[in-house]
Amino acid sequence: FEIALPRESNITVLIKLGTPTLLAKPCYIVISKRHTTMLSIKPGERILFTFSCQSPENHFVIEIQKNIDCMSGPCPFGEVQLQPSTSLLPTLNRTFIWDVKAHKSIGLELQFSIPRLRQFGPGESCPDGVTYSISGRIDATVVRIGTFCSNGTVSRIKMQEGVKMALHLPWFHPRNVSGFSIANRSSIKRLCIIESVFEGEGSATLMSANYPEGFPEDELMTWQFVIPAHLRASVSFLNFNLSNCERKEERVEYYIPGSTTNPEVFKLEDKQPGNMAGNFNLSLQGCDQDAQNPGILRLQFQVLVQHPQNESNKIYVVDLSNERATSLTIEPRPVKQSRKFVPGCFVCLESRTCSTNLTLTSGSKHKISFLCDNLTRLWMNVEKNISCTDHRYCQRKSYSLQVPSDIFHLPVELHDFSWKLLVPKDRLSLVLVPAQKLQQHTHEKPCNTSFSYLVASAIPSQDLYFGSFCPGGSIEQIQVKQNISVTLRTFAPSFRQEASRQGLTVSFIPYFKEEGVFTVTPDTKSKVYLRTPNWDRGLPSLTSVSWNISVPRDQVACLTFFKERTGVVCQTGRAFMIIQEQRTRAEEIFSLDEDALPKPRFHHHSFWVNISNCSPASGKQLDLLFWVTLTPRTVDLT
């Protein structure tokens, strides 16, 4: 190899050992029979050399640095060449460095030809291995503007007082152009300006200078976004830290087209604007930091550009002004993310404060709009607390658990509407009475309606799930001892059509000791499947639950248990089942941990089934499934 550098080129070449590898044989640079591991070539020098091994790219790297002095003479502006040409260089990993020094009053602009640049953060790398590292200067301090790959949106970076640009090319890369040019501009009066150009839908992730370390104290950095007129942009902060300010306040400022309040100033912790049409600027302003405990300011954010939907021009009013203790959240459905670009899906408050999820609280009217390619990507969850503090006032008081019609006007699907029903401990209990009798969801007879009621304890320490219930069954009411949550969960968009079938009434009733009581009136046409609460996890320790099963006068009920034995093993206590005829009060008691369950049996009159659990050994829980069928009486047995 021969490398010759012209005397006035201001280029130095350095060949040195790269990161050490575990290769057995060492490799050397050979210059007139002398072996060395480092070679420096200065302007005006011409050197012939070879390598002592077959694959020097595994051992050495080459750095080509060109110093451009714009302080003492005119600047060589225009397209930057790779000098010496890559064809003259040995095939090593190579880094071209351009170090441009300029006056503070001079602005320097790096312009990147298509496919432009994409900034990447710590721990990431470029697919093709081609990397741009760009730094600026504040007095004598070097500031990292960022590291970039190809295929992005960054088209220009403006700085002042000097630029250091490093282009890293892997040894196998055929590239022979720098891909950028330098131009001079007037002073930008800030650390830097990064221009990001979107041609169509897409996203860009950008970072403050020195990221993930701290942004320089009291500095200003600006990003200019060029957005096609027919698209909308939304900003979301992925990660940020605030420093400890002594004077001034850290903030971001937006220049948004059409805004009457430019610049719009936001704190970093605020929701950032979305649904913006046209070009806009975003600036990060630092503060004077506390000398003793400065902390760090840093910001990583994303700009998402997408087509507006028809819905984004509509304003929806959600009136929660007459509601109490209610919150409505619109959020993304959980989905597997694909690797390709996915347009953002935002919900906007007052059209501008857009985010991926939004919670509205009771007591106000809210105006919302959507910026989303497909509104089925969102769903709605509502929580409402109904509590009783004074048992004398609440007793026998009833509330209707009904989804307000306002919610059906919104263009997103309702997922859950949860009512948290809270009662004074040991003073009152609750009864749920459905508008239509309920069916308990079981594997044997699953619910196939568009919605179900999920009933569970709302006591933090208690893991008790009564079950999932849907309209069209035999359960007339559910009584529960203490605090519960009732969640109406929808399973299909057809819920809007079936909404009339929903409706539960909750009443506060005198306190009782059992965890739950189900009142069941079987249908003559079908089997009623019933199962103990907490199915698959087992009825909680020492819990008692009952079923009050009505048998019509002209019918006989057959009670059948799914298994011969429960399989429960008691660590302490015994588990009992008591079947009691309501007319005669005659009862049969079964020790569930010791004895077999009864064979199918016939009841001519209404009866109770009560199950009281022990403290089961782990893995040997009490789960019981049984069913009731009615058949007409053939003989009058009264």
């Epitope: 008692s544 008691c570 302490t572 206590g573 015994r574 049969e588 020790s591 010791e594 077999a596 022990c614």
Partner: antibody, heavy 124, light 107 residues
């Protein structure tokens, strides 16, 4: 009123067998676990065996395991204790006792009604 | 097995006085302890279960307390018919075990 009446006691030679019966009335027999408890002359109470209400589980004291068998016939409201390989130390008054059902209930049995006892003497 | 130890073996008290019988378990039996009374020539009678719950028809002068390994049966005011033998029984673990008994006699 709960009544328990033991029968079948008597004198038997060591190595011999005896079958005690306990006839129950005044309660739904199949609902309740039952036990046998014995008392040697001038000594304290010693639990012997127990059986669950439907006969699905049986329990024995180590001193009688393998020699005594507890069983029940719920259709006849009767509890049994088959005693084989009898030893002199098995000499005692044998009481049959009914379990109390308390919900939630303890693992073992609490005896809330007792028979008057059947005397068993093992002697040559 | 769990060994139940009652103390004292015999307790002499005057009628009308207060008396306390003790029962100690060799390991914890939680509250799974019962007390029985046995009169001469009769079957035992259940007094207390669950360490402190009086059985049906048992007068209020009998009370039980304790949990774990230490239990007591207390008579608030002894009647003449109370001077008989008392047994404690644990039912926390198999086998069920009784104490050796305490005889209450008139002083």
């Amino acid at each position: 009123e709960v009544q328990l009446l033991e029968s079948g006691g008597g004198l038997v030679q060591p190595g011999g067998s005896l079958r005690l019966s306990c006839a129950a009335s005044g309660f739904t027999f199949s609902n309740y676990a039952m036990s046998w408890v014995r008392q040697a002359p001038g000594k304290g109470l010693e639990w012997v065996s127990a059986i669950s209400g439907r006969g699905g589980s049986t329990y024995y004291a180590d001193s009688v395991k393998g020699r005594f068998t507890i069983s029940r016939d719920n259709s006849k409201n009767t509890l049994y204790l088959q005693m084989n390989s009898l030893r002199a130390e098995d000499t005692a008054v044998y009481y049959c006792a009914k379990d109390i059902v308390v919900v939630p209930a303890a693992k073992g049995y609490v005896m809330d009604a007792w028979g008057q006892g059947a005397s068993v003497t093992v002697s040559s | 097995e769990i060994v139940m130890t009652q103390s004292p073996a015999t307790l002499s008290v005057s009628p009308g006085e207060r008396a306390t019988l003790s029962c100690r378990a060799s390991q914890s039996v939680s509250s799974n302890l019962a007390w029985y009374q046995q009169k001469p020539g009769q079957a035992p009678r259940l007094l207390i279960y669950g360490a402190s719950t009086r059985a049906t028809g048992i007068p209020a002068r009998f009370s039980g307390s304790g949990s774990g390994t230490e239990f007591t049966l207390t008579f608030s005011s002894l009647q003449s018919e109370d001077f008989v033998v008392y047994y404690c029984q644990q039912y926390n673990n198999w086998p069920l075990t009784f104490g050796q008994g305490t005889r209450l006699e008139i002083k």
